[in-house]
Interface confidence: medium
């Protein structure tokens, strides 16, 4: 504990010398002297154990979720989940680590955010990166050829997010995948019909969905002159387009990437385009574009999906971007991308998109770097972005000042009287029984202001009163929270009574 | 800052040629896709052609297609309309507008006009 | 063809008015859609791009709002040099078109 002392005394002495000589404008060379000499003392003083104070707090890029915020979390996921099931999709879990080997290229340069766990028992595990490559690994497992699932739970990856706008490094994927051999198309156009329902239900403003296509990308940088050692760089900055201007987007390739000019220009000229169908027929009558196999193959299949779009009533959410090239190095066709459209104060702030809230694609070969065959299993599917949607929905709530319930309770069961807890006891479970959602406050002899304030607080419709007129009469209070307005109802009918009153169907079988 | 200067405009015989120009300046014009949109004297707009940036990919109106051919010379920072077998309809002020990625298809800069009158 | 109507094709307003334009596209276009402000004689000049995105340097005064087959341009507090026409163009498909145009004169 002396040495300590002694050694805390020479770090204060020597950081009075290194203050003295900066006062002074004592030469670099010995300032820089000097300062390491205190690190070192301050190293061999090391972390005191009893002044650490351990900051309480959530890893970074995580968060707790308040009930307020799973009340809305419950919300979405609900209409999410109801859209999955009425497209018929089945529903798996997988572990929330798999092997290493099993993420290990399959995410291209992503591949740096995976998170490794330290050596448990022998096997070199990582934490999922997304549920697309457990997905696949499922299929090839268990030897499946035809699917359609969905799966929702966590997925962690190792960046430094920007959570004020929905990005972290625990963060719900709610997906959505088709699996089999299928005409083409089609299951790519449910899948794009399914992006569209949930973000319409769920109200969170006017949206657009980019498409393009993993081959038309290809044969463009092809005819454009950009070699496959470029094309992931190259793609990254294409895909900023929606953010900056072309210029800027040409001077990152060229200065900062290395792109010859002329290459860059000739990219210009396709990525600075969108449109629908009629772009996709344009292209297809290109000089260029057309004679590229891959490009072609990719620019017909775009316009069979406009046709089903189209007969899906869609089509006008949909825009075909050149400038579409992010993604994943597993996708091999079509990709698509939704993003909010939002009203910003000055052009420059984000021209269009708040950022992507759901994304996907056909990924027709990963199920075969599994199989030690490589037998394929043709993949198309989505990914909702949850976590920026509840963002957004949690924002606009308060802005809107609208308060959340956060709990489903119906009813809640108060006395008007003391000592009438017994009798509350012998309702609520009555209730409970019955499959009514109720509640009491755990004391005695609550006031009913009390009762009832605490029902305007948590935003409980009903409350039942019992008194001992009532309990003489064989009958309980009703009353309306919001009303105010009360009946006498007979005990025997209270129950059917409360599930008219709250919509509940009559019978929970 | 941004400038667009139309030249070339006049009188036309039906049937007539006359080959636009657009100088532009303030910009790096081979980074931009360019147009040419009309107005016919008291009327609305109509999108006649577009061109992109380097290699020339062009679109045209309906009204115009066969007829009309748009060009450009990155090097002298020049777009052009040639304007063949005109028809009285096509009489018009012609103004050449440069426009963005992010909102493809908008003129967020546009020159002042010329005007072509085709009549016999 | 897309085709885009405007309505109505003439308003009269006094300085102070708030002032709404509206402009129908005869099929979905989500949010490409323009609005544009030209006086006699002059070029046209661009508001709004994306049906509500205010282009640099223009009075905040000019809103844009909606999408997909309905639009509207406002002006909240007409100014003197707010009398012109004005054009909405849609910029989902080629070739993109523009509404007739709606002339704002003064009461």
């Known amino acids: 504990m002396a040495e300590r002392a002694a050694l805390e005394e020479l770090v204060k002495l020597q950081g009075e010398r290194v203050r003295g000589l900066k006062q002074q404008k004592a030469s670099a060379e010995l300032i820089e002297e000097e300062v390491a000499k205190l690190l070192k003392l301050k190293a061999q003083l090391g972390p005191d154990e009893s002044k650490q104070k351990f900051v309480l707090k959530t890893p970074k890029g995580t968060r707790d979720y308040s009930p307020r915020q799973m009340a809305v979390r419950e919300k979405v996921f609900d209409v999410i989940i109801r859209c999955f099931k009425r497209h018929g999709a089945e529903v798996i879990d997988t572990p929330v680590f798999e092997l290493k080997e099993t993420l290990m290229g399959k995410y291209g340069e992503d591949s740096k955010l995976i998170y490794d766990l330290k050596d448990q028992g022998g096997e070199l595990l990582s934490l999922r990166y997304d549920l697309t490559v457990p997905f696949a690994r499922y299929l090839a497992m268990n030897k499946l050829t035809n699917i359609k699932r969905y799966h929702i739970a966590k997925v962690y990856r190792r960046d430094n997010p920007a959570m004020t706008r929905g990005r972290y490094r625990e963060f719900y994927q709610c997906d959505f995948d088709i699996a089999g051999n299928f005409d083409p198309m089609i299951p790519d156009a449910e899948c794009l019909k399914i992006m569209c329902e949930i973000l319409s239900s769920l109200q969170i403003g006017d949206f657009l969905v980019k498409v393009n296509d993993r081959r038309i990308l290809d044969g463009m940088f092809a005819i454009c002159g950009v070699s496959d050692s470029k094309f992931r760089t190259i793609c990254s900055s294409v895909d900023k387009l929606d953010k900056v201007s072309w210029e800027e987007v040409k001077n990152e390739m060229v200065g900062e990437k290395g792109l010859a000019p002329e290459v860059a220009d000739r990219i210009g000229d396709y990525v600075q385009q969108h449109g629908g169908v009629s772009l996709v027929e344009q292209l297809l009558q290109d000089p260029k574009l057309s004679q590229n196999k891959q490009a072609l193959e990719g620019l017909g299949d775009l316009k069979l999906l406009f046709e089903y779009l189209t007969l899906f009533g869609i089509d006008d959410k949909i825009s075909f971007d050149l400038s579409l090239a992010r993604g994943l190095d597993y996708y091999t066709g079509v990709i698509y991308e939704a993003v909010l459209l939002q009203t910003p104060a000055q052009a420059g702030e984000e021209p269009l998109g708040v950022g992507s809230v759901a994304a996907g694609g056909r990924y027709d070969g990963l199920v075969g770097m599994f199989d030690p065959k490589g037998r394929k299993v043709p993949c198309v599917g989505l990914s909702i972005g949850v976590e920026r949607i509840f963002s957004i929905v949690e924002q606009r709530l308060e802005a809107l000042e609208e308060k959340i319930r956060t709990t489903e309770t119906q009813v809640l069961v108060a006395s008007a009287q003391k000592k009438l807890l017994e009798e509350r006891l012998k309702l609520v479970s009555e209730l409970w029984d019955a499959g009514i959602k109720a509640e009491l406050l755990y004391k005695k002899n609550p006031k009913l202001l009390n009762q009832l304030q605490y029902c305007e607080e948590a935003g409980i419709p009903l409350v039942a009163i019992i008194g001992e007129q009532e309990l003489k009469d064989g009958v309980i209070k009703l009353r309306s929270v919001t009303s105010r307005e009360e009946v006498d109802v007979r005990r025997e009918d209270l129950v059917e009574e409360i599930k008219r009153r709250t919509g509940q169907p009559l019978c929970i079988c | 800052q941004v400038q667009l200067v139309e030249s070339g405009g006049g009188l036309v015989k039906p049937g007539g040629s006359l080959r636009l120009s657009c100088a532009a300046s303030?910009?790096?014009?081979?980074?931009?896709?360019m147009t040419w949109i009309r107005q016919a004297p008291g009327k609305g707009l109509e999108w006649v052609s577009y061109?992109?940036?380097?290699?020339?990919?062009?679109n045209y109106a309906d009204s115009v297609k066969g007829r009309f051919t748009i060009s450009r010379d990155n090097a002298k920072n020049s777009l052009y309309l040639q304007m063949n077998s005109l028809r009285d309809e096509d009489t018009a002020v012609y103004f050449c507008?440069?426009?963005?990625?992010?909102?493809?298809?908008?003129?967020?800069?546009w020159g002042q006009g010329t005007l072509v009158t085709v009549s016999s | 063809d897309i085709q885009m109507t405007q309505s109505p094709s003439s308003v009269s307003a006094s300085v102070g008015d708030r002032v709404t334009i509206t402009c129908r596209a005869s099929q979905g276009i989500s949010s490409w859609l323009a609005w544009y402000q030209q006086k006699p004689g002059r070029a046209p000049k661009l508001l709004i791009f994306a049906a509500s995105s205010l282009q640099s340097g223009v009075p905040s005064r000019f809103s844009g709002s909606g999408s997909g087959t309905h639009f509207t341009l406002t002006i909240s507090s007409l100014q003197p040099e707010d009398f012109a026409t004005y054009y909405c163009q849609q910029a989902k498909s080629f070739p993109y078109t523009f509404g007739q145009g709606t002339k704002l004169e003064i009461k």
């Open positions: 303030g910009f790096t014009f081979s980074d931009y896709y």
């Open positions: 507008a440069r426009y963005v990625y992010q909102v493809v298809a908008i003129g967020d800069y």
């Open positions: 061109i992109s940036g380097s290699f020339a990919y062009t």
